[in-house]
């Protein structure tokens, strides 16, 4: 798995170096997030042939995956940062069920499952230090999402396997849209 | 050719155990599931459990749970289960099948063992 | 859990003419754009045989006469022209999730 923002060598070889700004942490955050999404879809093309799943297989899905809409303000145009930091918070707190599933989905890269998980929740309170608005932010219910895993784990083989490069395709999608509208607060 | 071969046959007494198994042969063992089905005499089927081959991860119907252990052995290609502390409402033939994958794989069912609980 | 329910629980029908029988599921069976609905035929003393999986595919060596159809929660097998052989007991079942569950079956006769 690879190092966690912050712990990488150089950081500790130099100690008199600029602290990273809360607006970095984040980015640098978000970017070893999809660094991890990217090794676990890897293992997840390898092992079967989910990765050239026509768009229309896959939007044939009943998964309430966030997704961002011109509504939320994260794109540039209609762009509302408190707007849009209210949606990137609720859609990852919204995604931390779907992370949970792909926790013993994966074989060889079984920490890095864990690293893009754990890593998730330290974004999320990130970013809610930044949030000014945070009663606009709904959690997920727990017992909503607890039935939706068990849900998840019933279903058969070939549907696990789809359900998985679904989760990590949209997840994918959303931090990429998240870090683009940061980069712009 | 995917084909799953049952044991035998099994008349027991009440409060024994039995094990029966299911070899599979024509594909890669531990790449499908293996589920366990009931057929009591003259009626329908009912879902016992699975066991994943490549990792001996388990899943049971909690009705079976207790009653029914599944097990496999990847080097023999060949799934079992054991029933204990047996009544005569075990009495029922009992089907191993191999899990499909989407569109692309069936379903494939064994023949299935009878067993019959008597004193 | 899933339940289907699966009707006419018996049909007799004659030589040559159509048979259909109905499965209902309690939800969708359906999941990125395939049903996991199967059907097979059961003759005494024999294992179940895989007639249709995933709705509308044919087991090897099923006739062409055996024929699936059906989406989300509702499905039918229909054989026709019924010949002599398919007197036997039909059930469906569901293979998107577990437990796998299955109809309560249709003595099938021939008039």
């Known amino acids: 798995a690879p190092v966690p923002p912050g712990e990488d060598s150089k950081d500790v070889a130099a100690p008199h170096r600029q602290p990273l700004t809360s607006s970095e942490r984040i980015d640098k955050q978000i970017r070893y997030i999809l660094d991890g999404i990217s090794a676990l879809r890897k293992e997840t093309c390898n092992k079967s042939n989910m990765c050239e799943s026509s768009k229309e297989a896959l939007a044939e899905n009943n998964l309430n995956l966030p997704k961002m809409a011109e509504k939320d303000g994260c794109f540039q145009s209609g762009f509302n940062e408190e707007t849009c930091l209210v949606k990137i918070i609720t859609g990852l707190l919204e995604f931390e069920v779907y992370l949970e599933y792909l926790q013993n989905r994966f074989e060889s890269s079984e920490e890095q499952a864990r690293a893009v998980q754990m890593s998730t929740k330290v974004l999320i309170q990130f970013l809610q230090k930044k949030a000014k608005n945070l009663d606009a932010i709904t959690t997920p219910d727990p017992t909503t999402n607890a039935s939706l895993l068990t849900k998840l784990q019933a279903q058969n083989q070939w549907l696990q396997d789809m359900t998985t490069h679904l989760i990590l395709r949209s997840f994918k999608e959303f931090l990429q849209s998240s870090l683009r509208a940061l980069r712009q607060m | 050719e995917v084909q799953l071969q049952q044991s035998g046959p099994e008349l027991v007494k009440p409060g024994a155990s039995v094990k029966m198994s299911c070899k599979a042969s024509?594909?890669?063992?531990?790449?499908?599931?293996m589920h366990w089905v009931k057929q009591k005499p003259g009626q329908g089927l009912e879902w016992i459990g699975y066991?994943?081959?490549?990792?001996?991860?388990?899943k049971y119907n909690e009705k079976f749970k207790g009653k029914a252990t599944l097990t496999s052995d990847k080097s023999s290609s060949t799934a079992y289960m054991e029933l204990s502390s047996l009544t005569s409402e075990d009495s029922a033939v009992y089907y191993c099948?191999?899990?499909?994958?989407?569109?692309?794989?069936?379903?494939?069912w064994g023949q299935g063992t009878s067993v019959t609980v008597s004193s | 859990d899933i339940v289907l329910t699966q009707s006419p629980a018996s049909l007799a029908v004659s030589l040559g003419q159509r048979a259909t029988i109905s499965c209902r599921a309690s939800?969708?069976?359906?999941?990125?754009?395939?049903?996991?609905m199967n059907w097979f035929q059961q003759k005494p003393g024999q294992p179940p045989k895989l007639l249709i999986y995933?709705?509308?595919n044919q087991g090897s060596g099923v006739p062409a006469r055996f024929r699936g159809r059906g989406r989300g929660t509702r499905f039918r097998l229909n054989i026709h022209p019924m010949e002599e052989d398919d007197s036997a007991m039909y059930f469906c079942?569901?293979?998107?999730?577990?437990?796998?569950?299955f109809g309560g079956g249709t003595k099938l006769e021939i008039k």
């Open positions: 099948a191999r899990e499909g994958y989407g569109n692309l794989e069936r379903d494939c």
């Open positions: 024509g594909y890669t063992f531990t790449s499908y599931v």
């Open positions: 066991i994943n081959p490549y990792n001996d991860g388990t």
């Open positions: 939800e969708s069976v359906d999941g990125f754009g395939i049903s996991f």
């Open positions: 995933v709705a509308s």
């Open positions: 079942q569901q293979s998107k999730e577990v437990p796998w569950t």
